[in-house]
């Protein structure tokens, strides 16, 4: 077969080929940020000629053109400046309202390099309607000027702009517009990963929150967790494997889907995952009807086995057939469970479509979506039971209109996205479920994305202040209880002046809470062994603080999981009959267990907890500490089995002010507190300039650094005594 000519350079840009110069190969142009390629792509035909998708005239030279953002077509009850036909990257547009109207949204917006405006639609509203003025996004035209209950507004985009979101919205009884805000965008525009991850994550979190099986009910026997067997999520992952997707891109599709699976299984919801790859025909690699679809390792292994070559005989893009196979799966499940049963009706369904182009065979995918909506009985009441996310990758031949038609439309959420390339997709999936926006007390969720603040990464972390100075740290273990060290409280029982500083999304300084009561372990007495020549003894160095009010859960404030509780059991995805011993065996399962604590400046520092034989050699060093323990004969008099030991090799040592803070591990994207910082032989902060300065101990230091942390597995009776009504403990 003839190959296509190689004179396809683009001035100022670059290009890639999916299959070299051979027929069927897709040539994709790219330009530096702020420019877009015209045309975006070319396909090598079997005749040996390049064809530009969608082009009517003969082949023109490829060029990089400047990206521009759409201009406002109309702006009600106010004025905007400057008034241009379109705006260059970096250009601003400013909005002001007439008297009597209040500006909602962004007063100034800037054109970003992807052809999208930053900020939010500016609206001048006088608050007169049942629903707020829905505004007119830049580049759009709206018909309908009444905002009463039942009133409708319609939108269209000017010139060659493409509408994403809802073209029609209705003012609902609850004062909220149906659907999602329409946005007019250039056909070549795309989304930045940092915008997509939170948008996708927020929407997903709403769904996860709704599917959370730990419905708590007050009973006379304290709190029990009811696992709602009905709380179930079916997740369908559809991966495009058509000819225009290169093998490398398909690998990234798979990797991104694996990330998604990994994250979704880390939430305590009952989930089944289906995997479907498609080109001209769909191939079901895992069905929700298969019991293995509930097993993360099975799902990931079926993903790993997905083969790019499976579809080499049919290379079109049949999105209809892929979605139809989801419909057939749903139909079979409905027949199995019974159409009228709660077991069927309570399943939530999420479809994630990863594609690089528009469907070009098999009919309109919208038809399949209509069938899906019908079988799931999706109406205003059951809108929460279906979410379809349509994600286009590679700006080339992705059809905005089609993606928008397929994606769900929900108020304040977005379900249709176009990303520049598969790298951006990977970034999104890495970060999308790190937003931890769930408002219930789901434990041990920290935001792991690169741009998260320290407090968002460890939202359980709190600071304890006796008066003005900070003295100790602690960890939220519920929405009203903090776990910390007993030695922080050495002033008797007057805690009226003490404050606990908890993370707060509205303030970088956090929010201060008074202490309703302090429960200090009665076994703690630093002088208990003074007559044995042990000048300081930290056995039972544990305390609980009940805050005067409940903490509102947010990205910045959320409890850590305490092992040996039902909450932690769910997070670990362990079977229901698990015991405390099982948790200890799973979490402290090696001679050296990587763990973390939080530094004075909020950053997460690394340590290794020594277990078994290594614990003994870790603790042995204490015998060299002659000041605190002048005539010590048995190290175990000081380092009892209540303590975990760290501080060897490259470990960081905690400072005195980090006492009481959690010593925690990460498992399955969730965090579990196994200890709390108690005492040590070296203080890296002593006499430092500020919270950011730590000094490493010199290698020659005698004794070398060692740090001891109260082991929560050894404090179970005390924890159960005081938290029995707060947490749900497993049998020992």
């Amino acid at each position: 077969a003839p190959s296509c000519p190689q004179n396809v350079n683009i001035s100022g840009g670059t290009f890639t080929l999916s299959h070299g110069w051979a027929p069927g190969s897709l040539l994709t142009y790219s330009c530096p940020q702020g420019l877009y390629p015209s045309p975006a792509s070319r396909l090598c035909k079997s005749s040996g000629q390049w064809q530009t998708p969608g082009a009517t005239r003969s082949l023109s030279k490829a060029v990089c053109k400047p990206v521009r953002c759409p201009a406002p077509v109309s702006f009600e009850n106010g004025i905007y400046t400057p008034r241009l036909g379109s705006y260059p990257v970096g250009g601003n547009v400013s909005f002001e309202c007439e008297d009597g109207f209040i500006l909602r949204g962004s007063p100034v917006r800037q054109c970003r390099p992807n052809g999208m405006w930053d900020g939010e639609t500016a609206v001048c509203d006088n608050g007169a309607g049942h629903c707020p003025n829905p505004g007119i996004s830049l580049g759009a035209v709206r018909t309908g000027f009444r905002f009463g209950h039942g009133d409708k507004v319609r939108y269209r985009c000017s010139s060659n702009l493409v509408l994403t979101g809802s073209s029609e919205r209705e003012c609902q009884g609850n004062g909220v517009w149906s659907g999602t805000e329409p946005i007019c965008r250039q056909p070549y525009s795309y989304d930045f990963p940092e915008d997509v991850a939170p948008a996708l994550g927020t929407s997903f979190s709403h769904m996860l929150g709704a599917t959370n099986p730990t419905q708590k009910t007050k009973e006379s026997l304290g709190r029990k967790i009811q696992i709602q067997r009905s709380g179930h999520l079916n997740l369908y992952l559809l991966l495009d494997c058509s000819q225009s997707v290169s093998e490398n891109d398909f690998l990234i599709f798979k990797e991104s889907a694996s990330l998604m699976v990994d994250r979704i299984f880390s939430f305590e919801i009952n989930v089944s995952v289906a995997i479907i790859t498609f080109a001209s025909e769909p191939k079901v690699l895992m069905s929700v009807l298969n019991d293995n679809s509930r097993d993360m390792t099975e799902v990931i292994s079926s993903l790993e086995n997905a083969n790019y070559k499976d579809h080499e005989n049919g290379t079109g893009t049949n999105t209809y057939a892929a979605l139809n196979s989801v419909y057939l799966m749903m139909n079979n499940q409905m027949r199995l469970l019974g159409m009228e049963t709660m077991a069927w009706q309570e399943i939530r369904h999420a479809i994630i479509l990863l594609t690089d182009g528009k469907s070009n065979m098999g009919g309109s995918p919208k038809t399949a979506v209509d069938h899906i909506r019908e079988i799931l009985n999706i109406n205003q009441k059951r809108n929460d039971y279906l979410d379809i996310y349509a994600i286009g990758v590679g700006k080339l031949d992705v059809d905005w209109r089609e993606l928008n038609e397929l994606g769900s439309k929900k108020d304040g959420e977005r379900h249709a996205f176009i990303l520049q390339d598969t790298k951006a997709l990977h970034q999104v999936f890495e970060h999308m479920l790190d937003v931890s926006k769930l408002t219930d007390t789901i434990c041990g969720v920290g935001n792991m994305s690169a741009n998260a603040s320290d407090q968002e990464r460890t939202p359980w972390h709190v600071t304890i202040k006796p008066k003005s100075q900070e003295t100790c740290r602690g960890a939220l273990i519920s929405d009203q209880w903090v776990l910390t060290a007993a030695h922080c409280f050495r002033d008797g029982n007057d805690h009226s002046l003490w404050r606990v500083n908890v993370g707060d999304p509205k303030s970088q300084w956090g929010k201060e809470f008074l202490i309703e009561k302090a429960v200090i372990s009665p076994g703690f007495d630093v002088f208990a062994k003074k007559n044995q020549g042990i000048l300081e003894f930290y056995g039972d160095d544990i305390a609980l603080l009940k805050l005067a009010q409940k903490v509102k859960m947010s990205t910045h404030a959320r409890p850590i999981c305490l092992p040996c509780t039902m909450e932690a059991n769910l997070a670990l995805r362990r079977p229901q009959g698990s015991t405390c011993r099982d948790h200890e065996n799973e979490l402290l399962n090696k001679q050296s267990v990587p763990a973390h604590f939080v530094a004075l400046n909020g950053s997460k520092l690394n340590i290794n907890l020594k277990m078994g034989v290594e614990w003994t050699s870790c603790a042995e060093v204490v015998s060299q500490e002659k000041t605190m323990f002048p005539n010590l004969t048995d190290v175990r008099e000081v380092v009892t089995d209540q303590f975990l030991c760290s501080g060897t090799q490259e470990d960081e040592s905690p400072c005195k002010g980090e006492s009481g803070g959690a010593v925690f591990l990460e498992r399955r994207f969730r965090f579990f507190q196994v200890g709390l910082v108690s005492w040590g032989l070296y203080n890296p902060c002593l006499g430092s300039a500020d919270k950011n300065s730590r000094k490493r101990a010199p290698r020659s230091k005698v004794p070398p650094p060692r740090d001891f942390h109260i082991n929560l597995f050894r404090m179970q009776p005390w924890l159960r005594q005081h938290l029995g009504d707060v947490l749900n403990f497993l049998p020992l």
Epitope: S468, R490, V526, L535, T627, N683, L686, D690
Partner: nanobody
Amino acid sequence: QVQLVESGGGLVQPGGSLRLSCSASGHTFRSYYMGWFRQAPGKEREFVASISWTGGSTEYADSVKGRFTISRDNSKNTLYLQMNSLRAEDTAVYYCAADYSGDFLLSDLDSWGQGTLVTVSS
């Protein structure tokens, strides 16, 4: 907050000894870590020694280890620094400090004395 007053500074020959005292007012003295800092002319304030609230553990800057001894008497609300084998480079204003956490971060300390001058010179 603890009020602190240092005393015992003065002129001493190299190799000589001096004992500094720091008297604290406030019933909470016994629950504070206590420390000594010093500041030589034209230099930054630097950590010298600290003692835990229990009196059970002490820490020293490398430059004074083996020569200086920190101690406290909780019944008298007093902190001491015994300085032996003094050198010219020990010349500085010596400050007493109280810290609840025990880290003695310069940016966070809010209880300082006014300082007492120690001059080591022949």
